[in-house]
Amino acid sequence: FPMFKRGRCLCIGPGVKAVKVADIEKASIMYPSNNCDKIEVIITLKENKGQRCLNPKSKQARLIIKKVERKNF
């Protein structure tokens, strides 16, 4: 990610409900911390189309979180 300022969440607004799987280059999960008190799921889009926040309550976000946690633990 580019440099982020401390003390604030990375996303603004509720986030997208879903992103086409074919458009996803990578997914990053930011867990609650001193900087932000909520979980954030950030999707990097293919073809240099930037980044989008996924609504952490969406079905797709829950699947991604589960997948990442399974991989890490």
């Epitope: 990610f1 580019p2 440099m3 982020f4 604030r8 969440c9 990375l10 996303c11 603004i12 607004g13 509720p14 986030g15 997208v16 409900k17 992103v19 950030i42 999707i43 889009l45 240099n48 189309k49 930037g50 980044q51 989008r52 926040c53 996924l54 609504n55």
Partner: nanobody, 129 residues
């Protein structure tokens, strides 16, 4: 049909003020962040100020902090940008946009995405010295 209609632009002298309005319709206000972006000739479109109507979170570009204030009237589905102490470098076309999933750190050189973003037609703001 989604519509974002901006008003309030114009010509103003340095040090003056303007208030931009953006009337939104055709979508659920709380599902989106609403913001003001600007594009000066030959420059990238940049996020100026954004507000999440669902929780009131705001973002301001460093260049406008302390001078610009964003607010919403949820009953009217309208977003306002109060611009004070205007400088010649604030001259640009100002666009109102509604979007989902905006990442704050990417706002300085924003890449619009038609699947997630709606845009107004823009309003010209010119600040003369």
């Amino acid at each position: 049909e989604v519509q974002l209609v901006e008003s309030g632009g114009g010509l103003v002298q340095a040090g003056g003020s303007l208030r931009l309005s953006c009337a939104a319709s055709g979508f659920t206000f709380d599902d989106y962040a609403i913001g003001w972006f600007r594009q000066a000739p030959g420059k990238e479109r940049e996020g100026v100020s954004i507000i999440s109507s669902s929780d009131g979170t705001t973002y301001y570009a460093d260049s406008v902090k302390g001078r610009f204030t964003i607010s919403t009237d949820n009953a009217k589905n309208t977003v306002y940008l109060q611009m004070n102490s205007l400088k010649p470098e604030d001259t640009a076309v100002y666009y109102c946009a509604a979007g989902q999933g905006w990442v704050i750190a990417t706002m300085t050189s924003f890449r619009a995405h038609r699947e997630y973003d709606y845009w107004g037609q823009g309003t010209q703001v010119t600040v003369s010295s």
